[in-house]
């Protein structure tokens, strides 16, 4: 266990050309906040998967009026850390957004409004227990200064947080192969090598080998779930280690209460103990204002103070959804045209085109035969992005340079012989049969299954085909 | 300075219904979020319907199921439907308009609700 310290130094412009405008005015002046989210890993998530290390929200600023004409400086920042407590081991390395909210304190009659100004992210890897990180962000226009670290909670230590210190037995030293904890060096170190298979969510050790539960959980390795009703067993009440099992099902089985809501038993039945922003007997009712800040990617919320009062964001481009969570995916509307990859950049639409297309939306087809010869009397026929060569009798090939074979394809059926000849191929036909390709059988009487034969031609003589 | 326009407010009986227009005829509401607040005497405003600019729609608990807020953006008009009313409901409605760069408002228009 833990915390993550997050310490803001200053918002202000970036240095550069483009000043922003003061986000405050005399007509309306605001103040900052800040919240942070923090993620396990190395992952670029989006902005609005969940915060698995934790969140914090910072404390509001002083009230900030801009100066006419005056070119907007730092801005007035609020006190204090934003410290974002862990329960488990430090990962080491992890992701983090930081965004910037502007509180209006103008004559907002619904309440005050709140909109992101700035939202900044990174993925770094940082151990704990060591010295401040700091950091320069930008965003836009904006320029956020920042400094981190990660502290383990006692009795942990160590760079994950995930070694306890005990007092020392001995006054003298640690026992064997057990250091001192830096930088208490009147404690040891303790080894822990908890017991094969104890339940990493549900258990944990303060000696070598042993398995303790967290409340709620029991067994030898704590996988079995435990009610907190009293034991009817001569064990007498549960407790976190030794727990015991009481049939049948508990009020809390399947956890009645909604949105994250987290049940206890009562005597007579259950409670739900509601997260921020949701009421209820099961917590099903959104109890969700502005004031807590639901939009996501830069929404500009808008609503009552009053928890009756419904709320809303206004999305910025490329999001939709009640709290601007969902990402617009535009290429499924296809836009790009002829086979053309579409690539959503957030701020705009791209599309990558085909060899023979162009266009914003590869709408423009090319043409494809300019420049483009076709040989020996071949015509070019465009199509589909890409030329295609129609080749004069006796040649083929992409572009007509290959002169063709005219048997290759073994054009005479029932076993006539194929002759090349310069005007095309002639088919010399098996006995029986006939035609330019000796695709008709001749009648065992002499008779033709044609009209009468050319004249000049008998039946079984050589078929020209042109 | 551009305001919004309401219209459709009245006596109506309880349990009976009313539509509401907001309308503008200097601003495009299509890319805006527009909502009813309601106002009743001794009270603060309260955001009862609102369409965002990508046309989600959120209620306050007190009209969920009972009022539906729509815009036809030909007519550059937003629309409450108030059903099942109650005397509760009675109040001044306020057409609200806005986007990142700044927010409109109606004068109001009365919608009383008889027992």
């Known amino acids: 266990a833990g915390v993550f310290e997050l310490q803001i130094h200053s918002f202000g412009p970036g240095p550069g050309p483009g000043a922003p405008r003061s986000p405050c005015s005399a007509r309306l002046p605001c103040r900052l906040f800040f919240r942070v989210c923090l993620k396990p890993g190395l992952s670029e998530e989006a902005a609005e998967s969940p915060c698995a290390l934790g969140a914090a929200l910072s404390a509001r600023g002083p009230v900030y009026t801009e100066q006419p004409g005056a070119p907007a400086p730092d801005l007035p920042l609020p006190d204090g850390l934003l410290q974002v407590p862990f329960r488990d081991a430090w990962p080491g390395t992890f992701s983090f957004i930081i965004e910037t909210w502007r509180e209006e304190l103008g004559d907002q009659i619904g309440g005050p409004a709140w909109s992101l100004l700035a939202r900044v992210a990174g993925r770094r890897r940082l151990a704990a227990g060591g010295p401040w990180a700091r950091d320069i962000q930008r965003a836009g226009a904006w320029e956020l200064r920042f400094s981190y670290r990660a502290r383990c909670e006692p009795p942990a230590v160590g760079t994950a947080c995930t070694r306890l210190c005990r007092p020392r037995s001995a006054p003298s030293r640690c026992g064997p192969g057990l250091r001192p904890c830096a930088p208490l060096e009147d404690e040891c170190e303790a080894p822990l090598v908890c017991r094969a298979g104890c339940s990493p969510e549900h258990g944990f050790c303060e000696q070598p080998g042993e398995c303790r539960c967290l409340e709620g959980w029991t067994g030898p390795l704590c996988t079995v779930p435990v009610s907190t009703s009293s034991c009817l067993s001569p064990r007498g009440p549960s407790s976190a280690t030794t727990g015991c099992l009481v049939p049948g099902p508990g009020p809390c089985d399947g956890n009645p209460c909604a949105n994250g809501g987290s049940c206890s038993e009562t005597p007579r039945s259950f409670e739900c103990t509601c997260p921020r922003g949701f009421y209820g007997l099961r917590c099903e009712v959104s109890g969700v204002t502005c004031a807590d800040g639901p939009c996501f990617n830069g929404g500009l919320c808008v609503g009552g103070a009053d928890p009756d009062s419904a709320y809303i964001c206004h999305c910025p481009p490329g999001f939709q959804g009640s709290n601007c969570e969902k990402r617009v995916d535009r290429c499924s509307l296809q836009p790009c045209r002829n086979g053309g990859l579409c690539l959503d950049l957030g701020h705009a639409l791209r599309c990558r085109c085909r060899a023979g297309f162009a266009g914003p939306r590869c709408e423009h087809d090319l043409d494809d035969c300019a420049g483009r010869a076709c040989a020996n009397g071949g015509t070019c026929v465009e199509g589909g992005g890409a030329h295609r060569c129609s080749c004069a009798l006796g040649f083929g090939g992409r572009d007509c340079r290959e002169r063709a074979d005219p048997c290759a394809a073994r054009p005479c059926a029932h076993g006539g012989r194929c002759y090349a000849h310069f005007s095309g191929l002639v088919c010399a036909c098996a006995p029986g049969y006939m035609g330019a390709r000796c695709e008709f059988p001749v009648h065992p009487d002499g008779a033709s299954a044609l009209p009468a034969a050319p004249p000049g031609l008998r039946p079984g003589d050589p078929q020209r085909y042109l | 300075q551009v305001t919004l326009r309401e219209s459709g407010g009245g006596l109506v009986q309880a349990g009976g219904s009313l539509r509401l227009s907001c309308g503008a005829s200097?601003?495009?509401?299509?890319?805006?979020?527009v909502g009813w607040y309601r106002q009743a005497p001794g009270k603060q405003r309260v955001l009862v319907a609102v369409?965002?600019?990508?046309?989600?729609?959120n209620y306050a608990h007190s009209v969920k199921g009972r009022f539906t807020i729509s815009r036809d953006n030909a007519k550059n008009t937003v629309y409450l439907q108030m059903n099942s009313l109650k005397p509760e409901d009675t109040a001044v409605y306020y057409c609200?308009?806005?986007?990142?760069?700044?927010?409109?408002w109606g004068q109001g228009t009365l919608v009383t609700v008889k027992p």
């Open positions: 609200y308009a806005r986007d990142f760069e700044a927010e409109y």
């Open positions: 369409i965002s600019n990508v046309d989600s729609t």
């Open positions: 200097e601003i495009t509401l299509s890319d805006k979020t």
